[in-house]
Amino acid sequence: MMTGTIETTGNISAEKGGSIILQCHLSSTTAQVTQVNWEQQDQLLAICNADLGWHISPSFKDRVAPGPGLGLTLQSLTVNDTGEYFCIYHTYPDGTYTGRIFLEVLESSVAEHGARFQIP
């Protein structure tokens, strides 16, 4: 009986130009994790294979860093990064578990812009 569940960071937001950590955690199962895929809508971002380690898709190499753990760090965020992200845990013997995260990338706050200017 497969009792595993995926816990994710859920709906998260971050500022343009900043970075964010996408995290999932597989619990309530003793299944062995053989590989974790990170996907964004219709693109594969990265793979963490238990034997082979991390592989970052070439188109994301400059902006994606592996970890912490089985998570993924997205850097230099743009508004176009807004959307759904998926952590896909391939396990033995349970099968494949999928978690969803929605990321919203916001324009930098007015307060932050304002702090850059000196008022005479």
């Epitope: 497969m2 595993g4 569940t5 594969l44």
Partner: nanobody
């Protein structure tokens, strides 16, 4: 609403082959979890195979009773899942069902709880 329609069943001699098809519609999840199950007369329904598909590729899971004989595959362009059955035995005689589930609700495997079911297609293997 997800709809599943199986085809390809029939009668075959032991050692023969059949390919079952499952045409799917209304499946809107970005990842796909599809399964094949069978139920022989007077027996409980059992999982035969499952396939998980995403942009990162496909993973297939086949029950021990079908390993080395049955393969599951998917044609994304046709929204169709297949069960290729080779070296059929009389004990493979059963009604075969295609099933689908949300990929976000537990694991995808032939042992998982599936939500959507087709009407089934009969497979009869004679000795």
């Amino acid at each position: 609403q997800i709809q599943l329609v199986e085809s390809g069943g029939g009668s075959v001699q032991a050692g023969g082959s059949l390919r079952l098809s499952c045409a799917t519609s209304g499946y809107t999840y970005r990842q796909k979890c599809m399964g094949w199950f069978r139920q022989a007369p007077g027996k409980e329904r059992e999982g035969v195979a499952a396939i998980y598909t995403s942009v990162g590729g496909s993973r297939t899971y086949v029950a021990d009773s079908a390993k080395g004989r049955f393969t599951v595959s998917q044609d994304n362009a046709k929204n169709t899942v297949y069960l290729q059955m080779n070296s059929l035995k009389p004990e493979d005689t059963a009604m075969y069902y295609c099933a689908a589930k949300s990929p976000y609700d537990g694991a995808c495997s032939y042992e998982a709880d599936f939500t959507y079911w087709g009407q089934g297609t009969q497979v009869t293997v004679s000795s």
